[in-house]
């Protein structure tokens, strides 16, 4: 058993049918010695008396808010949560496996640049009685500071019969140098509590590996005289690290017909312009990627050919 | 890949070209190592990230772009700062800093070259003959060093009398390649920046 926060405790259980569970001793936080009784949640049934209460915690029915009273007055509370260990592996019931970039990916994180700011998000089908708390650091043995905000519900989607909820959090490394070569990964730890179930999820990454630039901005077409060709030009996104000559991007320019079946023409360039043939009803899209370290491509920025 | 739009300084341009070749070569070598050594811990998540140049060179600091010298987090391990009375830099100081930066890159390359050659000698003794260093990568290191055109005393190749532990050697190869790729990215950024300046 360990303390998650004041008056909230997590009991770790080896979870299998007929498991013996864990013996837990609760102590009433009071100078009083006599006339103390204990109850669980809203029930008025007295579970025991005395300054300490010993319970065998086996299942969720044994978890909850234990309260000690004296003469109708509440003295203190202890909330017991359960953390299930199933055959040596901590349960992952609360969050959905996003399966990207690999199986067992519960937390996904992205950064728009090298400033040390990043966003993580996760999915769940649970809509109520759900709380998250996020901590982060650079390295684990001698951790350096990363400050995270509160997790917020960022999107709701309908997936088949189920509703899916996306939560996200923004974090910022306290003293980040965009040019630094990372040798210690960023660690992100999410505590999830659903009703009386506790779970924790972690992700470990280097900022360089989670970079996904914003799409190029100011995408414009300039027709070339007496030609079906157009000059496409664009700019680096505002959110990208500066100077751009140091933090360079490379670009992919795509000409896509109206029909998804039509052949796509693609050009790769390090410049911020390109000359392409603009077909009728086609659209031109441009996306960006770090020129020197191949992390994710940005989303496409698009303009119609007409 | 197309080269940046800025008209390259004829002195810098060969270095930019060689640094791009270097990054391509080390990335290919790392990919090959990850595939060949699939039963070894060779992914970024599995290895310890060690920098053999730590405390010996200071490439990131010496080559920091002017624009980042205002960022205190970038300066905490710098002995020499670009900032002089808040005014523009004197060209002598700029060229001094650039020389410091390029010599630091040269020293990095020299250290990695020695490590890779020592390691290759060990790998050639492996009866499994599982992996060797790409000669192209070693050649590209050499080319960039020549283009940088610094003279410094040659570091003797390390020789070891004891029987090599091939498992440890292959894991060390992965660690070295990961670190060298990261340094190659920095070198490429620096060359691109200097080329545009």
């Amino acid at each position: 058993i360990w303390e998650l926060k004041k008056d909230v405790y997590v009991v770790e259980l080896d979870w299998y049918p007929d498991a013996p569970g864990e013996m837990v001793v609760l102590t009433c936080d009071t100078p009083e010695e006599d006339g103390i009784t204990w109850t669980l949640d809203q029930s008025s049934e007295v579970l025991g008396s005395g300054k300490t209460l010993t319970i065998q915690v086996k299942e969720f029915g044994d978890a909850g808010q234990y309260t000690c009273h004296k003469g109708g007055e509440v003295l203190s509370h202890s909330l017991l949560l359960l953390h299930k260990k199933e055959d040596g592996i901590w349960s992952t019931d609360i969050l959905k496996d996003q399966k990207e970039p690999k199986n067992k990916t519960f937390l996904r994180c992205e950064a728009k640049n090298y400033s040390g700011r990043f966003t993580c998000w996760w999915l769940t089908t649970i809509s109520t009685d759900l709380t998250f708390s996020v901590k982060s650091s650079r390295g684990s043995s001698d951790p350096q500071g990363v400050t995270c905000g509160a997790a917020t519900l960022s999107a709701e989607r309908v997936r088949g019969d189920n509703k899916e909820y996306e939560y996200s959090v923004e974090c910022q490394e306290d003293s980040a140098c965009p040019a630094a070569e990372e040798s210690l990964p960023i660690e992100v730890m999410v505590d999830a509590v659903h009703k009386l179930k506790y779970e924790n999820y972690t992700s470990s990454f280097f900022i360089r590996d989670i970079i996904k630039p914003d799409p190029p901005k100011n995408l414009q077409l300039k027709p070339l005289k007496n030609s079906r060709q157009v000059e496409v030009s664009w700019e680096y996104p505002d959110t990208w690290s500066t100077p751009h000559s140091y933090f360079s991007l490379t670009f992919c320019v795509q000409v896509q017909g109206k029909s998804k079946r039509e052949k796509k023409d693609r050009v790769f360039t390090d410049k911020t312009s390109a000359t392409v043939i603009c077909r009728k009803n086609a659209s031109i899209s441009v996306r960006a990627q770090d020129r020197y370290y191949s992390s994710s491509w940005s989303e496409w920025a698009s303009v119609p050919c007409s | 890949r197309n080269l940046p739009v800025a008209t390259p300084d004829p002195g810098m341009f060969p270095c930019l070209h060689h640094s791009q070749n270097l990054l391509r070569a080390v990335s290919n070598m790392l990919q090959k190592a990850r595939q060949t050594l699939e039963f070894y811990p060779c992914t970024s998540e599995e290895i310890d990230h060690e920098d053999i140049t730590k405390d010996k060179t200071s490439t990131v600091e010496a080559c920091l772009p002017l624009e980042l010298t205002k960022n205190e987090s970038c300066l905490n391990s710098r002995e020499t700062s670009f900032i002089t009375n808040g005014s523009c830099l004197a060209s002598r100081k700029t060229s001094f800093m650039m020389a410091l930066c390029l010599s630091s890159i040269y020293e990095d390359l020299k250290m990695y070259q020695v490590e890779f050659k020592t390691m290759n000698a060990k790998l050639l003794m492996d009866p499994k003959r599982q992996i060797f260093l790409d000669q192209n990568m070693l050649a590209v290191i050499d080319e960039l060093m020549q283009a940088l055109n610094f003279n410094s005393e040659t570091v003797p190749q390390k020789s070891s009398l004891e029987e090599p532990d091939f498992y440890k050697t292959k894991i060390k190869l992965c660690i070295l390649l990961h670190a060298f790729r990261i340094r190659a990215v920095t070198i490429d950024r620096v060359m691109s920046y200097l080329n545009a300046s």
């Epitope: 080896d14 049918p17 498991a19 199933e86 040596g88 592996i89 199986n103 | -």
Partner: antibody
Framework: QVQLVQSGGGVVQPGRSLRLSCAAS????????MHWVRQAPGKGLEWVAF????????YYADSVKGRFTISRDNSKNTLYLQMKSLRAEDTAVYYC????????WGQGTMVTVSS | SYVLTQPPSVSGTPGQRVTISCSGG????????VKWYQQLPGTAPKLLIY???QRPSGVPDRFSGSKSGTSASLAITGVQAEDEADYYC????????????FGTGTKVTVLG
């Protein structure tokens, strides 16, 4: 004490269907994940499928994906394996089993796919 | 498609020490715990060892398990006639959990 009693096995022709059941008692069935494991005659153990305690997630071996469906009825304390498009290579003893460091197995039920 | 490899058979005379190996990889045994099962002819498997080296109550102490790196082993010290059975190791793969990964199985024969 924990008990898993299986039923539903038998002889079936290739291409036909069969449903296996596994009735649980002696524990809170709705709190635990459950597996199906099979063993072809004279061969080793092969995992078939898993279902979460609440039925929210199901996982299948590639060899049965799209043909077999694992399900549970927590109000009836019963686990099921619906097997469709059966093939000769599905001939095996099928076991249900609880998920956890200490597990309990059903007695097994024989499924023979033969024309 | 077994990823955990066991020797097909091992044998010993009563009282001898018999060991069975189970070889896997970094993503399974290297990252997860190992169980061992005993299966007597015509019966369901019986758990002998869980969490690499833990014995459930009721399992004789002549059975012991261990794990090192990407392989595990089961030892029977002082093998007895009633130990003649098939033995299976089991683990998970970190990418496919909760799918059970079973070893190829080992037939233990007690001679004499």
């Amino acid at each position: 004490q924990v008990q898993l009693v299986q039923s539903g096995g038998g002889v079936v022709q290739p291409g036909r269907s069969l449903r296996l059941s596994c009735a649980a008692s002696g524990f809170t069935f709705s709190s635990y994940g459950m597996h199906w494991v099979r063993q072809a005659p004279g061969k080793g153990l092969e995992w078939v499928a898993f279902i979460r305690y609440d039925g929210s997630n199901k996982y299948y071996a590639d060899s049965v994906k799209g043909r077999f469906t694992i399900s549970r009825d927590n109000s009836k304390n019963t686990l099921y394996l619906q097997m469709k498009s059966l093939r000769a290579e599905d001939t095996a003893v099928y076991y249900c089993k609880t998920h956890g460091s200490h597990d309990n197995w059903g007695q097994g039920t024989m499924v023979t796919v033969s024309s | 498609s077994y990823v955990l490899t066991q020797p097909p058979s091992v044998s010993g005379t009563p009282g001898q020490r018999v060991t069975i190996s189970c070889s896997g990889g970094r993503s399974n045994i290297g990252s997860n715990t190992v169980k061992w099962y005993q299966q007597l002819p015509g019966t369901a498997p019986k758990l002998l060892i869980y969490a690499n080296d833990q014995r459930p109550s009721g399992v004789p102490d002549r059975f012991s398990g261990s794990k090192s790196g990407t392989s595990a082993s089961l030892a029977i010290t002082g093998v007895q006639a009633e130990d003649e059975a098939d033995y299976y190791c089991q683990s998970y793969d970190r990418g496919t959990h909760p799918a059970l990964l079973f070893g190829t199985g080992t037939k233990v024969t007690v001679l004499g």
